[in-house]
Amino acid sequence: EPHSLRYNLTVLSGDGSVQSGFLAEVHLDGQPFLRCDRQKCRAKPQGQWAEDVLGNKTWDRETRDLTGNGKDLRMTLAHIKDQKEGLHSLQEIRVCEIHEDNSTRSSQHFYYDGELFLSQNLETEEWTMPQSSRAQTLAMNVRNFLKEDAMKTKTHYHAMHADCLQELRRYLKSGVVLRRTVPPMVNVTRSEASEGNITVTCRASGFYPWNITLSWRQDGVSLSHDTQQWGDVLPDGNGTYQTWVATRICQGEEQRFTCYMEHSGNHSTHPVPSGKVLVLQSHWQHHHHHHGLNDIFEAQKIEWHE
């Protein structure tokens, strides 16, 4: 995977007027890295790993850049003519990447009320917009505004591209960081499912990167997919990830089952704890609970385009 730096800024308007303040998130190699919100923008490292990367650096430069970007985005939202009553959002996502062969990519995307309406390749300065007429009108309007503003302020898009890459390289230089691997903690629990059956759940948490194999084995052989239920791999808020897999087994056969985990070239097997049932709750309820969580994250993906 390429190294990447992604800026995600959102501004809001209510009943025709643009609200002060904005929300900004910066992701480094897909991990939450910096965050800025409300009236006061103070760029803060997200989680211990980000602090480890940048140490006790002052955040003035990040704060200044994000505040400037937020101000520009508020001006763009103020310019949009078709604002109706109610709450509206304008979101800008800017991404730059450095690939293994040292080639680079940069792009910028604009979303209005969660819908993509304008994209630009920052290297070629080529714009793309969707087919729908409403989005196209909005896109033309914003594109022209941005072009005029760029001429006034002598800002060129390739400069955005260069700045983003410069910043990314600076971050990469500053740490052993981003190709780091954090092994998961694996925990196996059991819960009563129905007469004579138990549900066993294997949870892996605190791992990075997100790619992981987690599955149940019976006598060392993988169970078929239709007998296992997996949770999504979700961020746990600490710059690491978590996931789970569950299956239903006959009580008394616990010794035949192990949870197999493989992550970043390392693997481990984890037996089912014997003895009393630890969690007196149907795990299939757990699953609905987890799907609820997943739905929240899916909703966040729609809103934040992550």
Epitope: R217, D219, G220, Q255, R256, T258, H267, P271
Partner: antibody, heavy 118, light 108 residues
Framework: QVQLKQSGPELVKPGASVKVSCKAS????????IYWVKQSHGKSLEWIGY????????VQNQKFKGKATLTVDKSSSTAYMHLNSLTSEDSAVYYC???????????WGQGTLVTVSS | DIVLTQSPTTMAASPGEKITITCSAS???????LHWYQQKPGFSPKLLIY???NLASGVPARFSGSGSGTSYSLTIGTMEAEDVATYYC?????????FGSGTKLEIK
């Protein structure tokens, strides 16, 4: 490629014990179970037990409990089966096998002939 | 213990002939847990078919497997001289794992 190389034939006296080894190569040893199977002369196959090399956990055929002890040495990627209090009934070829994760006995060792005779 | 009964015990077939070996289980087992092995004289057993109908790596397509519940079978579409061996079914559904008593296949 996956290979299981077993120790050579053993001629032992009744009442003695023997340790059969199975050296694995061509894959990550702790990733897959090692299974042990007995084949008496001209007879069918009998499953003895298996061991998870990662954590040393074993599951055994009740018939062989007290007869066979399964262990591993992770540093040398070798599994061992210790057979004790040997009688003529224990004369057989003993196989180790491992899995690819999809079927039980995917790969087999060449077998170790144990002969119990006075 | 689950007992697997194979039939026939021995059989002789001509090259090109179709062969079917059956394996009957004393209690029902899921098709995911039934496997077939081939053992040629003087050699270790070799996985032939796993999970009832999946051919193991390198096994010729003339071999096939089917069945469910208590009744399973192994078929050789056209017998070849190199297929002379003893064939075993094996269940992994319950502990202890058990094997069939074997079917010895000879050539006419």
């Amino acid at each position: 490629q996956v290979q299981l190389k077993q120790s050579g034939p053993e001629l032992v006296k009744p009442g003695a014990s023997v340790k059969v080894s199975c050296k694995a190569s061509g894959y990550a040893f702790t990733k897959y179970n090692i299974y042990w199977v007995k084949q008496s002369h001209g007879k069918s196959l009998e499953w003895i037990g298996y061991i998870d090399p990662y954590n040393g956990g074993t599951v055994q055929n009740q018939k062989f409990k007290g007869k066979a002890t399964l262990t591993v040495d992770k540093s040398s990627s070798t599994a061992y089966m210790h057979l004790n209090s040997l009688t003529s009934e224990d004369s057989a070829v003993y196989y180790c096998a491992t899995t690819d994760g999809y079927s039980l006995f995917t790969y087999w060792g060449q077998g170790t002939l144990v002969t119990v005779s006075s | 213990d689950i007992v697997l009964t194979q039939s026939p015990t021995t059989m002789a077939a001509s090259p090109g002939e179709k062969i079917t070996i059956t394996c009957s289980a004393s209690s029902s087992i899921s098709s995911n847990y039934l496997h077939w092995y081939q053992q040629k004289p003087g050699f270790s057993p070799k996985l032939l078919i796993y999970r009832t109908s999946n051919l193991a790596s390198g096994v010729p397509a003339r071999f096939s497997g089917s069945g469910s519940g208590t009744s399973y079978s192994l078929t050789i579409g056209t017998m070849e001289a190199e297929d002379v061996a003893t064939y075993y079914c094996q269940q992994g559904s319950s502990i202890p794992f058990t094997f069939g008593s074997g079917t010895k296949l000879e050539i006419k």
